[in-house]
Amino acid sequence: QEEDLPRPSISAEPGTVIPLGSHVTFVCRGPVGVQTFRLERDSRSTYNDTEDVSQASPSESEARFRIDSVREGNAGLYRCIYYKPPKWSEQSDYLELLVKESSGGPDSPDTEPGSSAGPTQRPSDNSHNEHAPASQGLKAEHLY
């Protein structure tokens, strides 16, 4: 399974400790050919899907999920999964987002540098939890 469906990785820019009101972007990465990236927020069983996938390198694609103004409620565990037809990948490791009281401007240097979570050992099951509704993404049609 890992050959054509490597586990995705997740990272956060500018980091995983974000001042209240600042922005953060989650970056999900997977192989070339991904149709949909899904960012899951496990603590609330919510997710966001996107088909806005770009090529990060000859062998890697990525999608970016931006939160413009971070609130306390955005703190928690995040992970990525992708759909490369006709298969869902396994989930990435968790990345924890911490939100702290702002002590400076939106881009003050008290954010930690970008952190990421990549592949580790394979989980014993490829089934996941239920999810709550997501935001509307792009529409596409494919033929096979």
Epitope: D4, G137, L138
Partner: antibody, heavy 118, light 107 residues
């Protein structure tokens, strides 16, 4: 409990169209792809295509591209499949099925019998 | 398209028997092989996904094995409620394809 409730049997004339529905309950409708499968005595089970309620993305089996149109209504958690230019070869039972992260059709509707006859 | 072949279209067995149903793919499907049970009333249920993983609520007498192109479903202790038709399905490439089914009957 996950349930997929399909619309009732249809008797339609050759050349006509039919639209069958699949109402989902017991889970987040937008979180899972909805697939459609045809079962006829001659060809067993055939995959028609899938629609992703979250993004609206659709993938068709090339064989059914000119025959089937997949749509969804998120407000009612219902998936639809329209079949057009019907012939006797389209007489079959059609199933909707939820495609899960396990990369399988984990839940199926009860099936809708479509009979094409003059 | 990948062809899925279930060479045995019907199979007779006695209650309590160990029954094995085979499925062959026309090319390597990397273990993306699922098994479904269809009851006489048309109800379809997932039994096993990814070759050998039991779907929730499925009795442990069902098991799956295989690799590459050859796969099998085993019912270790046949019960009356297992009378049904069993289909394999590959999910490695599009279009997803099914085997022709194996109808299991009681002797």
């Amino acid at each position: 409990e996950v349930q997929l409730q399909q619309s009732g049997p249809e008797l339609v004339k050759p050349g006509a169209s039919v639209k069958i529905s699949c109402k989902a309950s017991g889970y987040s409708f937008t979180g899972y792809f909805m697939n459609w499968v045809k079962q006829s005595p001659e060809k067993s089970l055939e995959w028609i295509g899938e629609i992703h309620p979250s993004t609206g993305s659709i993938i068709y089996n090339q064989k059914f591209k000119a025959k089937a149109t997949l749509t969804i209504d998120k407000s009612s958690s219902t998936a639809y499949m329209q079949l057009k230019s019907l012939t006797s070869e389209d007489s079959a039972v059609y199933y909707c099925a939820r495609f899960d992260y396990s990369n399988s059709f984990a839940y199926w509707g009860q099936g809708t019998l479509v009979t094409v006859s003059a | 398209d990948i062809q899925m072949t279930q060479t045995t279209s019907s199979l007779s067995a006695s209650l309590g028997d160990r029954v094995t149903i085979s499925c062959r793919a026309s090319q390597d499907i990397s273990n993306y092989l699922n098994w479904y049970q269809q009851k006489p009333d048309g109800t379809v249920k997932l039994l096993i996904y990814y070759t050998s993983r039991l779907h929730s609520g499925v009795p442990s007498r069902f098991s799956g094995s295989g690799s590459g192109t050859d796969y099998s479903l085993t019912i270790s202790n046949l019960e009356q409620e297992d009378i049904a038709t069993y289909f394999c399905q590959q999910g490695n490439t599009l279009p997803r394809t099914f085997g022709g089914g194996t109808k299991l009957e009681i002797k």
